[in-house]
């Protein structure tokens, strides 16, 4: 017998649907109406035929009371080819819900997103997470999607993007966005970062994650941030193959004084990179290839230094820096 496509946990909290049949019974998803977290995976199906069965232009206010009663706070939709018109129809209906985090993954969005009608209300998301989503509209996708969202978005995460650079002139500012995660875009690089960090569009950024994004030097990242006027408090550069030395012809870059936490773990470093901020609250250099304990003059002034998992550290070795947070145990790096 075929397994049920949807499973709801005993607490009515999480509901996961995997529609793998060529002709799925979408009505099975109705058992998820009581769930707070909902995941729907469409098995790579093309949802174009759906447009014939639903009126994407219908006034969503007719569903408002029903949708307001839903408990869903987190929604993940994955593995499908979705017409932009259908996506917009869903966003218009979800605008009446209590949805706070939307994750789209492994999706191919076809066609262009129509502009937001005057009477329509945007979706009040706190967090939008995109992983391996391709858009027919190329670089203008973020601007098109943004108009369907209220301006209170606080977290934007874009991984495995087919076009990680945005059409900056079309993008409006994100006044509430405190966290931007561009991790897992290995082709981004420092030039791509400059293109993605549209100047003055991210005025409230406090946390910036750039794991596995093809960054080469901390100084290069510093220059990209300075050019964009982005001043994060926390910067994650882990899982990049970083060079410790700076190109002598490159101009020196002054880090923003706002930066107090820097993650350089899993970066293949054989020495402490040059050009780090002068003062940090947290510096993570764990799981690198440091063969000797860093000298005080190589390090910024730092309260919490993590050096676990480097070759020079034998379990039980004395801590090399005041205020360090080494466990003395070499982690699995």
């Amino acid at each position: 017998t075929t397994p049920e496509p949807c499973e709801l946990d005993d607490e009515d909290f999480r509901c996961v649907c995997n529609f793998s049949e060529p002709q799925p019974d979408w009505s099975e998803a109705f058992q998820c109406v009581s769930a707070v977290e909902v995941e729907i995976h469409a098995g790579g199906l093309n949802l174009e035929p759906f447009l014939k069965r639903v009126d994407a232009d219908a006034d969503p206010r007719q569903y408002a009371d029903t949708v307001k009663a839903l408990r869903v706070r987190r929604l993940t939709v994955g593995a499908a080819q979705v017409p932009a018109q259908l996506l917009v129809g869903a966003l218009r209906v979800l605008a009446y819900s209590r949805l706070k985090e939307l994750t789209l993954e492994d999706l191919k969005i076809t066609g262009t997103m129509p502009p937001l009608p005057l009477e329509a209300t945007g979706l009040a998301l706190s967090s939008l997470r995109l992983r391996n989503v391709s858009w027919a509209t190329g670089r203008s996708w973020l601007a098109e999607l943004q108009q369907w969202l209220k301006p209170g978005l606080k977290v934007l995460s874009i991984a495995q993007a087919h076009s990680p650079a945005f059409s900056c002139e079309q993008v409006r500012a994100f006044p509430a966005l405190t966290s931007l995660d561009l991790s897992d875009n290995p082709g981004l690089g420092e030039r791509g970062l400059m293109a993605a960090l549209c100047p003055h569009k991210f005025p409230a950024i406090q946390n910036l994650a750039l794991r596995n994004t093809g960054m080469e030097t901390p100084t290069g990242v510093c220059a990209a941030l300075a050019a964009a006027g982005v001043q994060p408090h926390s910067l994650d550069l882990s899982h990049n193959s970083l060079r410790a030395t700076v190109n002598p012809s490159a101009p020196r870059c002054m880090w923003s004084s706002a930066l107090n936490s820097l993650n350089l773990s899993f970066a293949g470093l054989e020495q402490v990179p040059k050009g780090l901020p002068a003062k940090l609250r947290v510096l993570d250099l764990s799981c690198n290839r440091l063969n000797r304990a860093p000298q005080p003059d190589e390090l910024p002034e730092v309260d919490n230094l993590t050096l676990d998992g480097n070759p020079f550290l034998v379990p039980g070795t004395a801590l090399p820096h005041e205020g360090s947070m080494n466990s003395g145990v070499v982690p699995a790096c």
Partner: nanobody, 122 residues
Framework: QVQLQESGGGLVQSGGSLRLSCAVS????????MGWYRQAPGKGRELVAE??????NYADSVLGRFTISRDNAKNTVYLQMNSLKPEDTAVYYC?????????????????WGQGTQVTVSS
């Protein structure tokens, strides 16, 4: 760990007023979205009012009667309830959306208070 402490509930006559307070035990208050929800006996929890960046949102049933405000210096959010009706009787819950704060930089996270009872008699 962020905790929310509500106060100000009680028994009031129809047409009367109450002011609910919600104190947040955290210094990240200034970037946190706050809201008030209520749950009447046998019903689901519904949004009453919320304060987010640059916008305030009210349930249709309380528009013009309830006002949400915040005091950043005291890490407190308030719900001023005027012209109360018997149908406003419910447990009122304070809600904080911590997404994007230092406590939850990259994922959605919210916390709820324990609730305060509001009873409106006719």
């Amino acid at each position: 760990q962020v905790q929310l402490q509500e106060s100000g509930g009680g028994l009031v006559q129809s047409g009367g007023s109450l002011r609910l307070s919600c104190a947040v035990s955290s210094s990240i208050f200034s970037i946190v979205d706050m809201g008030w929800y209520r749950q009447a006996p046998g019903k689901g929890r519904e949004l009453v009012a919320e304060l987010s960046v640059g916008s305030t949102n009210y349930a249709d049933s309380v528009l013009g009667r309830f006002t949400i405000s915040r005091d950043n210096a005291k890490n407190t959010v308030y719900l001023q309830m005027n012209s109360l009706k018997p149908e406003d009787t419910a447990v009122y819950y304070c809600n904080a959306d911590l997404t994007g704060s230092s406590l939850s930089p990259y994922r959605y996270l919210e916390v709820w208070g324990q609730g305060t009872q509001v009873t409106v008699s006719s």
